[in-house]
């Protein structure tokens, strides 16, 4: 019997999307590249449920993790990597006192209970996101794909 695997091996399924939590570290820009290389995007958060799921994943592992949010284009104007603005309702997720832009901190990370802005050059873990396969048409969607890990080889 063929099984439906909506996500590649080592990816996590949640509400119609697949998420990859890296085990290595890259700066924010290289994290974007790593996600693109596997047909995904540095995570853009669309709902409170998704935010809670991702925050939990990050805090459980006690890792500081890049998301696809920055104010690099215009200081103080936070924008997702897909070009959408940060909605006012999402500003509650910043940790107390954040974002503070201390020392030009222009990229957002999952930091414990909430979000923090930090220097984009710093190497951190990252989360990629892509749509899950529907498992309705293509033969390949019924097969577990080969591992798709955007991690570089260990140093």
């Amino acid at each position: 019997e063929r099984l439906c695997h909506p996500c590649p091996w080592e990816w996590t399924f949640f509400q119609g999307n697949c998420y990859f939590m890296s085990n290595s570290q890259r700066n924010w820009h290289d994290s974007i590249t790593a996600c693109k290389e596997v047909g995904a995007q540095l995570v853009v958060i669309k709902s409170a449920e998704e935010q809670n799921f991702l925050q939990l994943q990050s805090s459980r592992s006690n890792r500081f993790t890049w998301m696809g949010l920055s104010d690099l284009n215009q200081e103080g104007t936070w924008q997702w990597v897909d070009g959408s603005p940060l909605l006012p309702s999402f500003k509650q997720y910043w940790n107390r006192g954040e974002p503070n832009n201390v020392g030009e901190e222009d990229c957002a990370e999952f930091s414990g209970n909430g979000w923090n802005d930090d220097k984009c050059n710093l190497a951190k873990f990252w989360i990629c996101k892509k749509s899950a396969a529907s498992c309705s048409r293509d033969e390949e969607q019924f097969l577990s794909p080969a591992p798709a890990t955007p991690n570089p080889p260990p140093a």
Partner: antibody, heavy 120, light 112 residues
């Protein structure tokens, strides 16, 4: 594998300056702060400051302000710590350490240390 | 500056027995993100320091599970469930909440 290799031992006279190097390998040099920590003979650890190898931004402990200068050369993945107006109580082993911000501010790799002796 | 105080400063350890080190900070190390910015390091004789625990209670990769960290705010503890001969050295706590980062005086673990 990640390595921080420091320059060799130095003997200096009071009032002179010393410059210690820390060559990084096995990782992206610009992605992690380099901290400098010293240890006087038989004593504990003392934080001196950090440098962001990407931007060159620094943060020095007040105690060393005006005497310490931290620099870097990304082209050779090397950080430097220069301490001027040396005194006998600056005799210590000086360590560089990589700060891993993926785990908070953990110093996950340390150099082997450079002994600086200040003696007339 | 945040002052870090360790006790005891000297700790005789018996192989196979537990050991415990206390670290107190002059102000809370609890960040608004919920993490305590307190790390533990071990400096073995003649070596550079090495990491053990980060963010108060998280064992770093490759650290034996006999080491554990606990505590929050201003009071922290490093426990070794069963001391081994290779655990000898000086243990330091370090606060990384704010600069200047500061270390405890160190606790020297020796085997009885």
């Amino acid at each position: 594998q990640v390595q921080l290799v420091q320059s060799g031992a130095e003997v200096k006279k009071p009032g002179a300056s010393v410059k210690v190097s820390c060559k990084a390998s096995g990782y992206t040099f610009t992605g992690y702060y380099i901290n400098w920590v010293r240890q006087a003979p038989g004593q504990g650890l003392e934080w001196m400051g950090w440098i962001n190898p990407n931007s060159g931004d620094t943060n020095y402990a007040q105690k060393f302000q005006g005497r310490v200068t931290m620099t870097r050369d990304p082209s050779i993945s090397t950080a430097y710590m220069e301490l001027s107006r040396l005194r006998s109580d600056d005799t210590a082993v000086y360590y560089c350490a990589r700060e891993n911000s993926g785990y908070g501010k953990l110093f996950d790799y340390w150099g082997q240390g450079t002994l600086v002796t200040v003696s007339s | 500056d945040i002052v870090m105080t360790q006790s005891p400063l000297s700790l005789p350890g018996t192989p196979g027995e537990p050991a415990s080190i206390s670290c107190r900070s002059s102000q809370s190390l609890l960040h608004s993100n919920g993490y305590n910015y307190l790390d533990w390091y071990l400096q073995k004789p003649g070596q550079s320091p090495q990491f053990l625990i980060y963010l108060g209670s998280n064992r770093a990769s490759g650290v034996p599970d006999r080491f554990s960290g606990s505590g929050s705010g201003t009071d922290f503890t490093l426990k070794i469930s069963r001391v081994e001969a290779e655990d000898v050295g000086v243990y330091y706590c370090m606060q990384a909440l704010q600069t200047p980062y500061t270390f405890g005086q160190g606790t020297k673990l020796e085997i009885k």
